[in-house]
């Protein structure tokens, strides 16, 4: 007789989740020599221990602490790139600008990127059928709590000038309810972070507006300034050109500047 299983509103755990996490861990240590001390089996055990046998609407940041400890990594000052609602471009950028890092360029972010997972209370099974949806079911689910935990840590350890890529095509360019707006902004440490520089990415080719004047950007500036961190903003009018110029900075068409309106 199949046992009763809670039906959640979100999609279930990603197929082959344990194998994917282990394989990604090995791949990451291959490419990042400074992380070769990492024991991928222990990483998986810590990951699993955070959500297996636990009610998936009652996950805490504490549950992820063993995993966070195993994945401890530091980013050099001035090299942290945060992003909100524009993940693909942020990742394309750090793939070219190899000395800058998004959360997904770090071990823990790399392991979990684009994956879903959850377990069930009192069983050792992974739930491949459904997992809690943040809006429809609960916010304290394994995936949401994971990203909140690692995003908090990523922001806390940032230093120097921190950059953030924002999507200028959204109605709220800065969204207080995003991970960036609700977690990362509030966990930048003023004693370590001198400034936050926002890059507002324009969507339309003919869009010449200064989106650094957007009310939500002004709201971000206010929050950051109150935390004694300086704020700068740049418009990236042509993201395709921006990436091209990161790849080939000597290109003559790049010398004229691809972003304008530098705000203090």
């Amino acid at each position: 007789v199949p046992r009763w299983r809670q039906q959640w509103s979100g999609s279930g755990t990603t197929s082959r989740f344990p194998e994917t996490v282990l394989a990604r861990c090995v791949k990451y240590t291959e490419v990042h020599p400074e992380m070769r001390h990492v024991d991928c089996q222990s990483v998986w055990d810590a990951f699993k221990g955070a959500f297996i046998s636990k009610y998936p609407c009652n996950i805490t940041e504490e549950d992820y602490q063993p995993l966070v400890k195993l994945g401890t990594q530091t980013v050099p000052c001035n090299k942290t790139l945060l992003w909100s609602r524009i993940k693909d471009l942020a990742h394309q950028f750090t793939q070219v600008q190899r000395d800058m890092f998004t959360l997904e360029d770090m071990l823990l972010g790399y392991l979990a990127d684009d994956l879903t997972w959850c377990g069930e209370f009192n069983t050792f099974e992974i739930n491949y059928q459904s997992c809690p949806d943040w809006r429809k079911d609960c916010s304290n689910n394994p995936v949401s709590v994971f990203w909140k935990t690692v995003s908090r840590r990523f922001a806390e350890t940032a230093c120097g000038v921190v950059h953030v890529m924002l999507n200028g095509s959204r109605s709220k360019i800065f969204d207080k309810n995003s991970t960036f707006g609700s977690v990362e902004v509030h966990n930048l440490q003023p004693e370590k972070v001198q400034a936050l520089e926002a890059w507002v990415i324009h969507g339309g080719r003919e869009d010449s507006r200064d989106l650094c004047q957007d009310p939500t950007i002004k709201e971000l500036e206010s929050i950051i300034s109150k935390r004694n961190i300086r704020f700068f903003c740049k418009n990236i009018y042509r993201p395709d050109k921006f990436l091209q110029c990161v790849k080939n900075p000597e290109d003559s068409s790049c010398l004229s500047g691809i972003h304008h309106h530098h705000h203090h």
Epitope: T29, E30, R36, D39, Q41, D45, P66
Partner: antibody, heavy 121, light 107 residues
Framework: QVTLKESGPTLVKPTQTLTLTCTFS??????????VGWIRQPPGKALEWLAH???????RYNPALKSRLTITKDTSKNQVVLTMTNMDPVDTATYYC?????????????WGQGTLVTVSS | DIQMTQSPSSLSASVGDRVTITCQAS??????VAWYQQKPGKAPKLLIY???YRYTGVPSRFSGSGSGTDFTFTISSLQPEDIATYYC?????????FGQGTKLEIK
């Protein structure tokens, strides 16, 4: 089947430099994810990790001995060489080489038989 | 450096006995602990890694458990061929460190 074998002098004088070679088969250091390390064991005592080298020439040393150690590899000969300078009688030990594999971090799963090195004048 | 304190340093047991060896790390190593068996005049052999995973071909009577700082190695039913010295090792961080060993003898 993976096999490793250590070779080198059985006797060295104090202040001299020790050179040990680990020759292996069934293992290639041109293969991503593989590495070889050195561990020693003084007579009747515990094991002490010395150094490791990975397929891509990434090296790790025991900080307490780092200034005296050099690890290198010759991929074409399937060999890893450890040199240890300024030998002292306290360095008398059986020296082992062993394989490591990415993902299990620094767990040694295959070991050589060991070679006893005595430091004496 | 992380110190690995093994106990007991020696123990005597009878064939068929359940044998337990403990290892304490001086700081949290999560589950990054391995156990090796070394017979006189031979190289160590890997038995357990990542605290509880039996290495390929290792008999099921050998097991490991623990996390954080406290780890246990167990032989569920001692066999004559198990007479050896057993070492724990943390593989959490460099420098890799070993316990001082537990010498196991038959009564």
């Amino acid at each position: 089947q993976v096999t490793l074998k250590e070779s080198g002098p059985t006797l060295v004088k104090p202040t001299q430099t020790l050179t040990l070679t680990c020759t292996f088969s069934g293992l290639s250091l041109s293969t991503s994810g593989k590495g070889v390390g050195w561990i020693r064991q003084p007579p009747g005592k515990a094991l002490e990790w010395l150094a490791h080298i990975w397929w891509d020439d990434d090296k790790r040393y025991n900080p307490a001995l780092k200034s005296r150690l050099t690890i290198t590899k010759d991929t074409s000969k399937n060999q890893v060489v450890l040199t240890m300078t300024n030998m002292d009688p306290v360095d008398t030990a059986t020296y082992y080489c062993a394989r490591i594999e990415l993902g299990r971090s620094y767990v040694m799963d295959y070991w050589g038989q060991g070679t006893l090195v005595t430091v004496s004048s | 450096d992380i110190q690995m304190t093994q106990s007991p340093s020696s123990l005597s047991a009878s064939v068929g006995d359940r044998v337990t060896i403990t290892c304490q790390a001086s700081q949290d190593v999560i589950t990054s602990v391995a156990w090796y068996q070394q017979k006189p005049g031979k190289a160590p052999k890997l038995l357990i890694y990542s605290a509880s995973y039996r290495y390929t071909g290792v008999p099921s009577r050998f097991s490991g458990s623990g996390s954080g700082t406290d780890f246990t190695f167990t032989i569920s039913s001692l066999q004559p061929e198990d007479i050896a010295t057993y070492y724990c090792q943390q593989h959490y961080t460099i420098p890799l460190t070993f316990g001082q060993g537990t010498k196991l003898e038959i009564k």
